[in-house]
């Protein structure tokens, strides 16, 4: 399958997951915290202020970096996998903090954690898709 198709499919699945997570967590438009988000690379679950969310490098990265085997679970509720399966020190794990200002930037850079550069420039325009 073409990588663009995989991205579109992942994005659609992500938005569905976020919607279900919102229902489970009781999130709505006026809820404090950070809405779930598809950042063109991976899916981020809704989070409360002060929460650090961890995700593993997406399956897609195996196309670009087939020698690297990554965990496939992400942290969080329901569709977002098992929080015990990821560790802060794990390779192939990216985190964001939910702050009062919204989501922090990912740490580390996707290129370092996953072996593939998501943007030519790390400060370029980024089309994030939120669902709250």
């Amino acid at each position: 399958m073409h990588s663009d198709c995989i991205f579109k499919k992942e994005q659609a699945m992500c938005l569905e997951k976020i919607q279900r997570a919102n229902e489970l967590m009781g999130f709505n438009d006026s809820s404090p915290g950070c809405p779930g988000m598809w950042d063109n690379i991976t899916c981020w679950k809704p989070a409360h202020v002060g929460e650090m969310v961890l995700v593993s490098c997406p399956e897609l990265f195996r196309i670009f970096n087939p020698d690297q085997v990554w965990e496939t679970e992400t942290i969080g509720e329901s569709d977002f996998g098992d929080s015990n399966s990821l560790d802060l020190s794990d390779m192939g794990v990216v985190s964001r903090n939910c702050t009062e200002d919204g989501w922090s930037e990912p740490f580390p850079h996707y290129f370092d954690a996953c072996g593939f550069d998501e943007y030519e420039s790390e400060t370029g325009d980024q089309d994030y898709y939120y669902l709250s």
């Epitope: 650090m52 802060l88 020190s89 390779m91 985190s95 903090n97 702050t99 200002d101 922090s104 930037e105 740490f107 580390p108 290129f111 370092d112 072996g115 420039s121 790390e122 400060t123």
Partner: antibody, heavy 118, light 108 residues
Framework: QVQLQESGPGLVKPSETLSLTCTVS????????WSWIRQPAGKGLEWIGR???????NYNPSLKSRVTMSIGTSKNQFSLKLSSVTAADTAVYYC????????????WGRGTLVTVSS | EIVLTQSPGTLSLSPGERATLSCRAS???????LAWYQQKPGQAPRLLIY???SRATGIPDRFSGSGSGTDFTLTISRLEPEDFAVFYC?????????FGQGTKVEIK
């Protein structure tokens, strides 16, 4: 208390290679990014480059052709090599690490003065 | 390369006064990627502020950071004798990671 310590020759001849090592002492620490930064006397800070724990590197374009960084197998030390040095490379060299999941250097070495002179 | 320009170059103030230091970026920098450090003579820099506005552990609350986009500010609400030093901003968003040229806060 965990500390970083830079070590290496304080005097290097022009055209030779400057070699420095940064060692973690006083405990162990898992670092994400290891960096080298230098500061000529009375001047500002210049970022030389960094290496991620996986080994991926990124160097300042102004020095890229002369710089090599590596992490020791025990991951408690990392090194800097700067080739073809000139007097302009005379500076205090600092190692610094990102040990937390955040974009900041949370631990710095005390710095070591390297003089390039014949 | 993102150029960080700090102003003023030198700030001459008395203890007890308020210091306002500016850091202007040549391109947009996400708040997450902006940090401030303090450096005293003969010492390594020390982290003050990360994420543009979060104080590092052990940093007194007289230090505060603000700003977004291309304009960032470090404020010291009431200068103490030990605060006089050189202050640097730094960005991690785009390679090469860069520092501002520094602002020296000296005793008037």
């Amino acid at each position: 208390q965990v500390q970083l310590q830079e070590s290496g020759p304080g005097l290097v001849k022009p055209s030779e290679t400057l070699s420095l090592t940064c060692t973690v002492s006083g405990g162990s620490i898992s670092s994400y990014y290891w960096s080298w930064i230098r500061q000529p006397a009375g001047k500002g800070l210049e970022w030389i480059g960094r290496i991620y724990t996986s080994g991926s590197t990124n160097y300042n374009p102004s020095l890229k052709s002369r710089v090599t960084m590596s992490i020791g197998t025990s991951k408690n030390q990392f090194s800097l090599k700067l080739s073809s040095v000139t007097a302009a490379d005379t500076a205090v060299y600092y190692c610094a690490i990102i040990a937390s999941r955040g974009w900041y250097f949370d631990l710095w070495g005390r710095g070591t003065l390297v003089t390039v002179s014949s | 390369e993102i150029v960080l320009t700090q102003s003023p170059g030198t700030l001459s103030l008395s203890p007890g006064e308020r210091a306002t230091l500016s850091c202007r970026a040549s391109q947009t920098v996400s708040r997450s990627y902006l940090a401030w450090y303090q450096q005293k003579p003969g010492q390594a820099p020390r982290l003050l502020i990360y994420g543009a506005s979060s104080r590092a552990t052990g940093i007194p609350d007289r230090f505060s950071g603000s700003g977004s986009g291309t304009d960032f500010t470090l404020t010291i609400s009431r200068l103490e004798p030990e605060d006089f030093a050189v202050f640097y901003c730094q960005q991690f968003g785009s390679s090469p990671w860069t520092f501002g040229q520094g602002t020296k806060v000296e005793i008037k």
